[in-house]
């Protein structure tokens, strides 16, 4: 379907990290504007970003209502200054996005090591439980609240004096690892959802090393 002098949007792409979700598309508009609609499989479409000249639309507020649903967005093109105009089929020109299931597809944001504490030859490493924009009972949920045991963290750790890495895994946000007494260690963590087929892993967190301010050390 089409409207004279308008170009259909193309390259509709979901950009989503920790459920913050933006739909992007092309082209930059010339004498046209866009409106976005989003729907679950019910086909009850909700309009967002009305008559915009942007080529992105923040759909976070819609997808966080149920992150396990599958969503589709469509971008309508209208002639600038004549948004009532429709195509020969009685509808404005539109293009569909790919399907998007936030729970299965949102990228896992880069995690942060919140703290580490050494007690003798044990070190407890804690990963920050990042807040998402998903709400329950008017409270923002953390990544762990949303994913539960589907989310694990992998810890990479190594002696500051060597390059050989060891790994540990946890389905909480804490690790308890054995270390050699008197050695300084460096740590990096990665969020992983093993059950996923796409976007399974986050990027690695910034490296934190013992002897720097994040840690607490108690020799026993």
């Amino acid at each position: 379907s089409g409207t004279t002098n308008t170009v259909a949007a193309y390259n509709l792409t979901w950009k989503s990290t920790n459920f913050k979700t933006i739909l992007e598309w092309e082209p930059k508009p010339v004498n046209q504007v866009y409106t976005v609609q989003i729907s679950t499989k019910s086909g009850d479409w909700k309009s967002k970003c009305f008559y915009t000249t942007d080529t992105e639309c923040d759909l976070t507020d819609e997808i966080v209502k149920d992150v396990k649903q599958t969503y589709l967005a469509r971008v309508f093109s209208y002639p600038a200054g004549n948004v009532e105009s429709t195509g020969s089929a009685g509808e404005p020109l539109y293009e569909n996005s790919p399907e998007f299931t936030p729970y299965l597809e949102t990228n896992l944001g880069q995690p942060t090591i919140q703290s580490f504490e050494q007690v003798g030859t044990k070190v407890n490493v804690t990963v920050e439980d990042e807040r998402t924009l998903v709400r329950r009972n008017n409270t923002f949920l953390s990544l762990r609240d949303v994913f539960g045991k589907d989310l694990i963290y992998t810890l990479y750790y190594w002696k500051s004096s060597s390059s050989g890495k060891k790994t540990a895994k946890t389905n909480t946000n804490e690790f308890l690892i054995d270390v050699d007494k008197g050695e300084n260690y460096c740590f990096s963590v990665q969020a992983v959802i093993p059950s996923r087929t796409v976007n399974r892993k986050s990027t690695d967190s910034p490296v934190e090393c013992m002897g720097q301010e994040k840690g607490e050390f108690r020799e026993i």
Epitope: S1, Y10, S42, E91, E95, N96
Partner: antibody, heavy 118, light 108 residues
Framework: EVQLLESGGGLVQPGGSLRLSCAAS????????MSWVRQAPGKGLEWVSV????????YYADSVKGRFTISRDNSKNTLYLQMNSLRAEDTAVYYC???????????WGQGTLVTVSS | EIVLTQSPGTLSLSPGERATLSCRAS???????LAWYQQKPGQAPRLLIY???SRATGIPDRFSGSGSGTDFTLTISRLEPEDFAVYYC?????????FGQGTKVEIK
């Protein structure tokens, strides 16, 4: 397992009315668009109407607009098609279909035959 | 409304051969607003492909869809005995939704 079971078909005279029903099970009914598609004997498929999950949006083929009304009762997991002012050319097998986004039809019932004849 | 024209009307092939079915729209239906269905005698249609190229649940990978805009293709890489049937394309780029007239794939 998704199941769609149509009923209400039969023989009706031109100008008469008929109400088709489609009982759905095996999925969350209110979460999906639903549609009616028909097929005249020996002919191809013809889309008739579609309704969104909430019932708030409906579309019709030009050939039935003003005569047919699609509706749904989400509490009963049932889809309906009220057919008025029936014509001989409405004779067909009527299929109920699950319609994600009101776009395409991923599960179909086995159909119910509507015959309009004097 | 958008008119879909399928070709050929009938395709006579042997099991094991490749089948290529065409669906052409009278105007653009967008890059991906097309579905393909299979129907056997006395049965309801079955969804094969949606979004022009995405296989529906449980559909064997010998079925593939391609195309965009006005020209779409359904390919069956190696015909199995159970694939002989009528195939319909359907667009959802605008309302009313419309079907092609069908292509019959018959045993040669």
């Amino acid at each position: 397992e998704v199941q769609l079971l149509e009923s209400g078909g039969g023989l009706v005279q031109p100008g008469g009315s008929l109400r088709l029903s489609c009982a759905a099970s095996g999925f969350t009914f209110s979460s999906y668009g639903m549609s009616w598609v028909r097929q005249a004997p020996g002919k191809g498929l013809e889309w008739v109407s579609v309704i969104s999950g909430s019932g708030g949006t409906t579309y019709y083929a030009d050939s039935v607009k003003g005569r047919f009304t699609i509706s749904r009762d989400n509490s009963k997991n049932t889809l309906y098609l009220q057919m008025n002012s029936l014509r001989a050319e409405d004779t067909a097998v009527y299929y109920c279909a699950k319609a994600p986004w009101t776009y395409y039809f991923d599960y179909w019932g086995q159909g119910t035959l509507v015959t309009v004849s004097s | 409304e958008i008119v879909l024209t399928q070709s050929p009307g009938t395709l006579s092939l042997s099991p094991g051969e490749r089948a290529t079915l065409s669906c052409r729209a009278s105007q653009s239906v967008g890059s991906s607003s097309l579905a393909w269905y299979q129907q056997k005698p006395g049965q309801a249609p079955r969804l094969l492909i949606y979004g022009a190229s995405s296989r529906a649940t449980g559909i064997p990978d010998r079925f593939s869809g391609s195309g965009s805009g006005t020209d779409f293709t359904l390919t069956i890489s190696r015909l199995e005995p159970e694939d002989f049937a009528v195939y319909y394309c359907q667009q959802y780029g605008s309302s009313p939704r419309t079907f092609g007239q069908g292509t019959k794939v018959e045993i040669k």
